[in-house]
Interface confidence: medium
């Protein structure tokens, strides 16, 4: 007996071939022996099966001996023994019919976890793997979970069904929605303006829901709501904003939020949330700022960072041109009795310059400035 | 202790500009915000805006946008409210003010006098 | 803008009693467990004074005969006992949304 496997929803066409090659009469039935289609000389005639509607053949081919049945928008139950009677002959063809399905939703959030379900029919026992867009393969049975989606995991899925040594190839478009970076770290002189950017991984068509940045100075005791926001249809609309420091926010896509300057006492860590219209849970990017304030006082010239550096960070006073006369895996670094000219200030992370600060010092009569 | 210093008075016809300035001591300058408040003689107080002395970001009230310029000289530890196409309803005491510790606007400027007069 | 409306427009109190002054907001101006609201005292001639911050917090310095409370919508300022010095406008304002706004005031006279 001839298998053939079908996808729930799609078109499946059984053949069936006469010796002779020419338009003779033939009958498909399926396994209750209740007609589907047939023909009576050139016409198509219908039989009382539930495919009804759904059935069809090519009277193109009848003439070269070919007899199909066309079996449009399968479903599970389609899956049949299929008899074809012609020319005194029965050719069976066994049809089996699967649908893969995606848990509710095709758009998951970072995070959460996917569950492909294989609809089968009874009595059949196929195994499924899939491949992810980054290749990682999955195998399974009726189910298959994937947790803790990621942002790569986003793209056409491949998943292939296979019985009796047949396969069946399903494609599912996934879309992870989450920001393009996990978290971001923004480094900043003391006084400049900063610019905060929060880019999503993906598109759709209409975007809702409401977002908050949560603050947690470096030298403050808790954390802080610094804004919070709506997103109607890709607008941005803000809700409430603190009066300090007061954040500005872009109207459009991507997320896009202005500190009016880097100060010490802003310098930490904050967390952007956004939680989405009919989805549970919501997405997160950290964002981290970094601010460096050089000065001089009476004999004093010094450097510091506030913010969350990392241990490697090495932080340099240096005079221009001239070697390091100081360089620490500190936050704050000095020189006592600096000479006149123009030093600068470093952090750098395995050489590569991060921040920088120029300050001026000037002869020991006059007063510092800073350019 | 913080201090907030201002100009002294000002007479100026319709239609000119003023600038008044206010000097702080006794903290650094760019940390706080500097906010200008206006009191027209015998009336309430209302928000003009406010400056980021260390960007020079400014925020103003709708009702001032068109007329107001607020700006800062970190050099001097200086800010300044400019107000341009002055009318009678301009003649009024302009504050500045920096907060405190909390929401509130702890320090103030002793006041400018402000009178436009034909 | 949040509209902010006290009464009484003025009032007159006797030596050592209590003068309560009321602040009514146009919309909330709560948010994170906090109320946006502060107060100022101001004296002919003179710059406003801070009194409270944050709709009940004393600011340094100021005596603890003034107290602040509400939230929302509704805010309070107590005086009590008054004294001599008190004699003053009082004014409420907001902090929680821009343009930050003030109340008319209310003229506070001791009997």
């Known amino acids: 007996k001839k298998v053939v496997l079908g996808k729930k929803g799609d078109t499946v066409e059984l053949t069936c071939t006469a010796s002779q090659k020419k338009s003779i009469q033939f009958h498909w039935k399926n396994s209750n022996q209740i007609k589907i289609l047939g023909n009576q000389g050139s016409f198509l005639t219908k039989g009382p099966s539930k495919l009804n509607d759904r059935a069809d053949s090519r009277r193109s081919l009848w003439d070269q001996g070919n007899f199909p049945l066309i079996i449009k928008n399968l479903k599970i139950e389609d899956s049949d023994t299929y008899i074809c009677e012609v020319e005194d002959q029965k050719e069976e063809v066994q049809l089996l019919v699967f649908g893969l399905t995606a848990n509710s939703d095709t758009h998951l959030l970072q995070g959460q976890s996917l569950t492909l379900t294989l609809e089968s029919p009874p009595g059949s026992s196929p195994s499924v793997q899939c491949r992810s867009p980054r290749g990682k393969n999955i195998q399974g049975g009726k189910t298959l979970s994937v947790s803790q989606l990621e942002l790569q995991d986003s793209g056409t899925w491949t998943c292939t069904v296979l019985q009796n040594q047949k396969k069946v190839e399903f494609k599912i478009d996934i879309v992870v929605l989450a920001f393009q970076k996990a978290s971001s770290i923004v480094y900043k002189k003391e006084g400049e303006q900063v610019e905060f950017s929060f880019p999503l991984a993906f598109t759709v068509e209409k975007l809702t829901g409401s977002g908050e940045l949560w603050w947690q100075a470096e030298r403050a005791s808790s954390s802080k709501s610094w804004i919070t926001f709506d997103l109607k249809n890709k607008e941005v609309s803000v809700k409430r904003v603190t009066q300090d420091p007061k954040l500005q926010m872009g109207k459009k896509l991507p997320l896009h939020l202005t500190l009016p300057q880097a100060l010490p006492q802003y310098a930490g860590s904050g967390n952007l949330t956004l939680a989405l219209e009919a989805k549970t849970g919501k997405l997160h990017q950290e964002v981290n700022l970094v601010v460096m304030r050089a000065t001089q006082l009476q004999k004093n010239l010094t450097c510091e960072v506030w913010g969350p550096t990392s241990p490697k960070l090495m932080l340099s006073l240096k005079l221009e041109n001239k070697e390091a006369k100081v360089s620490k895996r500190e936050k704050a670094v000095w020189v006592l009795n600096p000479e006149a000219g123009m030093w600068q200030c470093l952090l750098s992370d395995s050489g590569q310059v991060l921040l920088e600060s120029n300050i001026k010092v000037l002869p020991t009569w006059s007063t510092p400035v800073q350019p | 202790q913080v201090q907030l210093v201002q100009s002294g008075p000002e007479l100026k016809k319709p239609g000119a500009s003023v600038k008044v300035s206010c000097k702080a001591s006794g903290y650094t300058f760019t940390d706080y915000v500097i906010h200008w408040v206006k009191q027209a003689t015998g009336q309430g107080l209302e928000w003009i805006g406010e400056?980021?002395?260390?960007?020079?970001?400014?925020y103003s009230n709708a009702k001032f946008k068109d007329r107001v310029t607020m700006t800062a000289d970190k050099s001097s530890n200086t800010a300044y409210m400019e107000l341009s196409s002055l009318t009678s309803d301009d003649t009024a005491v302009y504050f500045c003010?920096?907060?405190?510790?909390?929401?509130?606007?702890?320090?103030w400027g002793q006041g400018t006098l402000v009178t436009v007069s034909s | 803008d949040i509209v902010l409306t006290q009464s009484p427009a003025s009032l007159a109190v006797s030596l050592g009693q209590r003068a309560t002054i009321t602040c009514k907001a146009g919309?909330?101006?709560?948010?994170?467990?906090?109320?946006?609201m502060n107060w100022y005292q101001q004296k002919p001639g003179q710059p406003p004074k801070l009194l409270i911050y944050?709709?009940?917090n004393l600011e340094s310095g100021i005596p603890a005969r003034f107290s602040g409370s509400g939230s929302g919508t509704d805010f309070t300022l107590n005086i009590h006992p008054v004294e001599e010095n008190d004699a003053a406008t009082y004014y409420c304002q907001q902090s929680y949304k821009d343009p930050l706004t003030f109340g008319q005031g209310t003229k506070l006279e001791i009997k």
């Open positions: 003010a920096r907060r405190g510790n909390g929401t509130g606007f702890a320090y």
């Open positions: 944050v709709a009940s």
């Open positions: 400056i980021y002395p260390g960007s020079g970001s400014a």
């Open positions: 919309q909330s101006v709560d948010y994170d467990g906090d109320s946006y």
